[in-house]
Interface confidence: low
């Protein structure tokens, strides 16, 4: 009762909101809401009624399974969707689906904040720039991942000659997509000409 399921999808995709269990037998009424009381569609044993909402024309209800199909979801569709079923007994049952719609991440730009030759070692500070997104960062040196504690938007490290890498890659990802940006250096410690 009231169990919350999380779902993450990419914007522009078509989504099916459904529950993992079968609907109560011979239910009287089924209603899908977004937020707690905004009706999307209601089925009452005869027909489906679609309500005036931002979803009108983009949704379809399957009364058999209770599944709600939404086409071309956008970030504005982020919400908790609630399916409420009124049983013949008069009791109510509800299921919640928290839908998170994410845009595909854009390709990141690597900015060289500082590059300095220090006693035959190379001090490197790179930032991975991506506009206003909540993403995960993974840094690679010549395709080898840096340690986990270095994984954020800024890579700051001092490399000894035996650890020099020629190219540094920042991979940004969210749960629906991933993109890479790469910058290459000339040994021992200068930016390569592009």
């Amino acid at each position: 009762q009231g169990h919350l399921v999380h779902m993450t999808v990419v914007s522009g995709s078509n989504v099916t909101l459904n529950i993992s269990e079968s609907l109560p037998e011979n239910y009287k009424q089924l209603t899908w809401f977004y937020t707690f009381d905004q009706k999307i569609v209601e089925w009452d044993s005869r027909k489906s009624k679609y309500f005036e909402s931002k979803f009108k024309g983009r949704v379809r209800l399957d009364p058999q399974s209770g599944a709600l199909y939404i086409s071309k979801v956008q970030k504005e569709d982020n919400s908790t969707y609630i399916m409420r079923v009124l049983k013949k007994t008069g009791n109510e049952q509800e299921w919640k689906i928290k839908l998170q719609v994410l845009d595909p991440v854009p390709k990141p730009v690597i900015k060289i904040e500082k590059i300095e030759d220090m006693d035959d070692n190379c001090y490197l500070k790179l930032s991975c720039v991506i506009p206003g997104e909540s993403v995960n960062y993974t840094w690679y040196g010549d395709k080898r991942p840096f340690p986990k504690e270095l994984q954020n938007s800024v890579l700051e490290t001092t490399l000894m000659p035996h650890n020099y890498s020629r190219c540094y890659t920042c991979q940004v990802s969210n749960s629906v997509s991933s993109k890479n940006g790469t910058v290459c250096l000339s040994p021992p410690c200068t930016l390569a000409r592009s």
Epitope: T35, F36, F51, G90, N91, E92, Q93
Partner: antibody
Framework: EVQLLESGGGLVHPGGSLRLSCAAS????????MSWVRQAPGKGLEWVSL????????YYADSVKGRFTIFRDNSKNTLYLQMISLRAEDSAVYYC???????????WGQGTLVTVSS | EIVLTQSPGTLSLSPGERVTLSCRAS???????LAWYQQKPGQAPRLLIY???SRATGIPDRFSGSGSGTDFTLTISRLEPEDFAVYYC?????????FGQGTKVEIK
Amino acid sequence: EVQLLESGGGLVHPGGSLRLSCAASGFTFGGYAMSWVRQAPGKGLEWVSLISGSGGSTYYADSVKGRFTIFRDNSKNTLYLQMISLRAEDSAVYYCAKYSNYDYFDPWGQGTLVTVSS
Amino acid sequence: EIVLTQSPGTLSLSPGERVTLSCRASQSVSSSYLAWYQQKPGQAPRLLIYGASSRATGIPDRFSGSGSGTDFTLTISRLEPEDFAVYYCQQYGSSPRTFGQGTKVEIK
């Protein structure tokens, strides 16, 4: 006949607490969402809180969020509103009302008066 | 949130007269999700109209509702002595549910 009977109101000092109850009869209580609506003396109506029939979902007006808790005991056909950190502006008659399919309120109880004053 | 403005604030009328109460919304009320309630002194509100124009169970047919979008009206075709009260409109098309400030219908 559907009946709703509120109780638990009274005089309380600012910062104090109260618990309101609403005893329901005449309908399958667990099948319906319930709400609290308040009315300050001489003023209009303000929706306060909502709870789904199962009790699994609760919602609050911004003015009471974090201070009020709505809950229900379907075995006792009773709705509750726990109020803490009460302020003078919470003074009102508190009505419980049956939510008709998350739309309008019908019927309402007779109300219980809460007065917050030092 | 949708703000509902009722007018006039007070109406002084005699029994038998026709009454028209107005409720204007700050933005369109979805699918005419508007209700009207009657409240007498010392009593709880009572549902009169829902869906802008449907009469609730047991409400006399002298009460009627109309309107859509942002403009709604409650009409009492012929005032009875028991109709003197405060009338509230309420929208349930979007969250949070909101009420108008009320119109008082008093005896002249």
